[in-house]
């Protein structure tokens, strides 16, 4: 999904509103400096990209995080303020595959929404230049 | 495997009110987004408001006047409708997204809202 014609504002007000909150909660317990900021984004399409991937694909020690809050609501904020997001077909790889339904928080599901939130406030600051 | 079903459209006055039911099944509803979109005649489908773990979010064009909700026990979705105008003449869909897969919505077959005098 090309995600240049979302509504970025609209998204980041949801972000800050719930989306933050939720990421928090999540992280609840881990000192902000236990983790590494390694994944990057150069712009908000790119961000939303970064951050859609991070969420919803599952990883090596982390197949957990789809459904969490903070993802259910990233999905619904990107389905209102992105023209085309909820018609997005599935792909024969993505549908074959089996998802753990149970809900496991592992070190390196912490990790991986450290990332997230550094993601998430990098989209909120555009104008800054990558470092 | 998973049904939406729409009901509670029809023809409603400007500035009238109008309530539309969202039966889900084969799923639960806390597991899922839900939302509700629509299509006016020769437009795009765009998105009008999705709910997702308590928290809704809301199009600009009907923040104020539309208000969704979900009721787990009825497994219903709801989308309150008030101070409708002409623009909001639309096919109205109910959408749900299991949280797996990223972009992907089920749709339902749609209910038709006009507004008109």
């Known amino acids: 999904y090309d995600f240049t014609n979302c509504d970025f504002e609209k998204i980041k007000a949801a972000y800050l509103s719930t989306i933050s909150k939720d990421l928090i909660t999540y992280m609840s317990g881990t000192k902000s400096t236990e983790f590494n900021n390694t994944v990057s984004c150069s712009n908000r399409p790119h961000c939303l990209t970064e951050i859609q991937s991070l969420t919803f694909n599952p990883t090596a020690g982390c197949a957990s995080l789809a459904k969490e809050m903070f993802a259910m609501k990233t999905k619904a904020a990107l389905a209102i303020w992105c023209p085309g997001y909820s018609e997005t077909q599935i792909n024969a790889t993505q549908a074959m595959k089996k998802r753990r339904k149970r809900k496991v928080t592992t070190n390196k599901c912490l990790e991986q929404v450290s990332q997230l939130q550094g993601l998430w406030r990098r989209f909120n600051r555009p104008l800054l230049k990558q470092q | 495997e998973v049904q939406l079903v729409e009901s509670g459209g029809g023809l409603v006055q400007p500035g009238g009110s109008l309530r539309l039911s969202c039966a889900a099944s084969?799923?639960?509803?806390?597991?899922?987004?839900m939302g509700w979109f629509r299509q006016a005649p020769g437009k795009e489908r765009e998105g009008v408001a999705t709910?997702?773990?308590?928290?809704?979010y809301y199009a600009d064009s009907v923040k104020g006047r539309f208000t969704i909700s979900a009721d787990n026990s009825k497994n219903t979705a709801y989308l309150q409708m008030n101070s409708l105008k002409p623009e909001d003449t639309a096919v109205y869909y109910c959408?749900?997204?299991?949280?797996?897969?990223?972009?992907?919505?089920?749709w339902g077959q749609g209910t038709l809202v006009t507004v008109s005098s």
């Open positions: 084969g799923f639960t509803l806390d597991d899922y987004v």
């Open positions: 959408a749900s997204s299991g949280s797996y897969y990223p972009g992907h919505f089920e």
């Open positions: 709910i997702a773990g308590g928290g809704t």
